[in-house]
């Protein structure tokens, strides 16, 4: 017999076909010899089936000898034998039904558990195969889980479902609740305006929820809550703020906030969370902010970085337009009894400046200039 | 897999440019500092200088100031190192090298490439 | 700039035995901001580009069998082959990438006696 695989919620079409290219008198089946449908003449008749008001035809089909019967909203519980009566001839075609459900919610905050659930007749035993919207294939029964979800597993998950040598394929769409990105630094210098922005990799119609930054100075023992906000329908509000530093927050999407001046005691890490209505746990982006002071005292020359910077980077003091006077994996150099001119303190990755600060070296009778 | 291809050996004379090649593949071109470092016959190695391929800054040894120029080709993924007013002394081997991820020490480098300079 | 000094300049050491090699900086190249020393330890076979197998003065590099080892901190230096295998025969250099500019050892050649 024929086997032919449907999904939950869609509309199937089982063919019967006559030897005779005219309409003629057939009856559609289930296993349990219960009339579905069939035809009186050009009347489309009714059995007394559970598929009732589901359950039509293709008259227009009916005068090349093609008697379909179609079931639409499939569910599971329509996985049967189906029996088309014509000509004296039974044609049998088996149905099969399967679901493919997303165990919560499609929209999932990230590090969370995504499973899919694979609802299927008694008696049959599909394999599952999925591919997710970066190309990672996982296979399973029944369920597949996949834990801990990123950012790039948000989009088109397609799924295809195996069984008797046929397939068919559920398309789902998953959003993966997130800010762009889970990390970013900040290079600044003492005394400049300093701009944190948290941009979110996802857009819906409505946000609501509240958030908080939790700042950890490098210079301090413990962490501190430096702003709390809400979040009604992608409107932010400020709930509470510290005296010092005191920081603005803008009132719209993308959240954004400003610290007034970049300051030594300030660079260090944060992290900011935002907690959504209806959704269990939190998102999270980690922001770093690094300042950079160039000094003059007396004959001393220094340069220094505060905050969480690589091993990697290389901190420079050199005169404009000459070779670097110091060159050092440190987070202060100094230059002794420096020549006058402007000099120029370089913190940079494999040659990329990623902060400059600049100090004018006048002659030993003058006091220093900072531009 | 990760590797830095080199272009081929080259003769030149005295006063003249060379521009040797390097490209890269197996690994993401933008995230890793290229120094370049060279090695004449029978001597040690000699570091010249290093270029960030995601902005293409530079960083040059004080010795080659002024006669190196170090350049990249992203869409390549290929950097290049030109030396000009060449002189006998600067026959050697040049070699590129990737910085580590987490250090800068030299993980991966160049198959190198023999430059002649002879009148 | 910083002096890197090997010694030996060559060294003979029988198959199985232990091979020491020095490394001297003419400054120290321990961060005192990040707590690291910036030294490294490569190998180089004839006709071959230089191989990394120690950063970080003691953290070998991907790899590298664990006969090899760094050790030494500030401006003193060592790498150790505890038991000498026939491939090992090469010139070994220290290098410091503390400062630039990046500076290497004049080498070490190691053979077998």
């Known amino acids: 017999k024929k086997v032919v695989l449907g999904k939950k919620g869609d509309t199937v079409e089982l063919t019967c076909t006559a030897s005779q290219k005219k309409s003629i008198q057939f009856h559609w089946k289930n296993s349990n010899q219960i009339k579905i449908l069939g035809n009186q003449g050009s009347f489309l008749t009714k059995g007394p089936s559970k598929l009732n008001d589901r359950a039509d035809s293709r008259r227009s089909l009916w005068d090349q000898g093609n008697f379909p019967l179609i079931i639409k909203n499939l569910k599971i519980e329509d996985s049967d034998t189906y029996i088309c009566e014509v000509e004296d001839q039974k044609e049998e075609v088996q149905l099969l039904v399967f679901g493919l459900t997303a165990n919560s919610d499609t929209h999932l905050l990230q590090g969370q558990s995504l499973t899919l659930t694979l609802e299927s007749p008694p008696g049959s035993s599909p394999s599952v195969q999925c591919r997710s919207p970066r190309g990672k294939n996982i296979q399973g029964g029944k369920t597949l889980s996949v834990s801990q979800l990123e950012l790039q597993d948000s989009g088109t998950w397609t799924c295809t479902v195996l069984q008797n040598q046929k397939k068919v394929e559920f398309k789902i769409d998953i959003v993966v609740l997130a800010f762009q990105k889970a990390s970013s630094i900040v290079y600044k210098k003492e005394g400049e305006q300093v701009e944190f922005s948290f941009p979110l990799a996802f857009t819906v119609e409505k946000l609501t929820g509240s958030g908080e930054l939790w700042w950890q100075a490098e210079r301090a023992s413990s962490s501190k809550s430096w702003i709390t906000f809400d979040l009604k329908n992608k409107e932010v509000s400020v709930k509470r703020v510290t005296q010092d530093p005191k920081l603005q927050m803008g009132k719209k999407l993308p959240l954004h906030l400003t610290l007034p001046q970049a300051l030594p005691q300030y660079a260090g890490s944060g992290n900011l969370t935002l907690a959504l209505e209806a959704k269990t746990g939190k998102l999270h982006q980690e922001v770093n902010l690094v300042v950079m002071r160039a000094t003059q005292l007396q004959k001393n020359l220094t340069c220094e970085v505060w905050g969480p910077t690589s091993p990697k980077l290389m901190l420079s003091l050199k005169l404009e337009n000459k070779e670097a006077k110091v060159s050092k994996r440190e987070k202060a150099v100094w230059v002794l009894n420096p020549e006058a001119g402007m000099w120029q303190c370089l913190l940079s990755d494999s040659g990329q400046v990623l902060l400059e600060s600049n100090i004018k070296v006048l002659p030993t009778w003058s006091t220093p200039v900072q531009p | 897999q990760v590797q830095l291809v080199q272009s081929g050996a080259e003769v030149k004379k005295p006063g003249a440019s060379v521009k040797v090649s390097c490209k890269a593949s197996g690994f993401t071109f933008t995230d890793y500092g290229i120094s370049w470092v060279r090695q004449a016959p029978g001597q040690g190695l000699e570091w010249m200088g290093i270029i960030n391929p995601s902005g293409g800054s530079t960083s040059y040894a004080q010795k080659f100031q002024g006669r190196v120029t170090m350049t990249r080709d992203t869409s390549t993924s290929t950097v290049y190192m030109e030396l000009s007013s060449l002189r006998s002394e600067d026959t050697a081997v040049y070699y590129c090298?990737?910085?580590?991820?987490?250090?800068?020490?030299?993980?991966?480098w160049g198959q190198g490439t023999m430059v002649t300079v002879s009148s | 700039d910083i002096v890197m000094t090997q010694s030996p300049d060559s060294l003979a050491v029988s198959l199985g035995e232990r091979a020491t090699i020095n490394c001297k900086s003419s400054?120290?190249?321990?961060?005192?901001?990040?707590?690291?020393?910036?030294l490294a330890w490569y190998q180089q076979k004839p006709g071959q580009p230089p191989k990394l197998l120690i950063y970080?003065?003691?953290t070998r590099a991907s790899g590298v069998p664990d006969r090899f080892s760094g050790s030494g901190s500030g401006t003193d230096f060592t790498l150790t082959i505890s038991s000498l295998q026939a491939e090992d025969v090469a010139v070994y250099y220290c290098q410091q990438y503390y400062s630039t500019p990046f500076t290497f050892g004049q080498g070490t050649k190691l053979e077998i006696k």
């Open positions: 090298a990737r910085e580590g991820r987490s250090h800068d020490a030299f993980d991966i």
């Open positions: 400054q120290s190249v321990l961060s005192s901001s990040y707590n690291k020393n910036y």
């Open positions: 970080w003065a003691s």
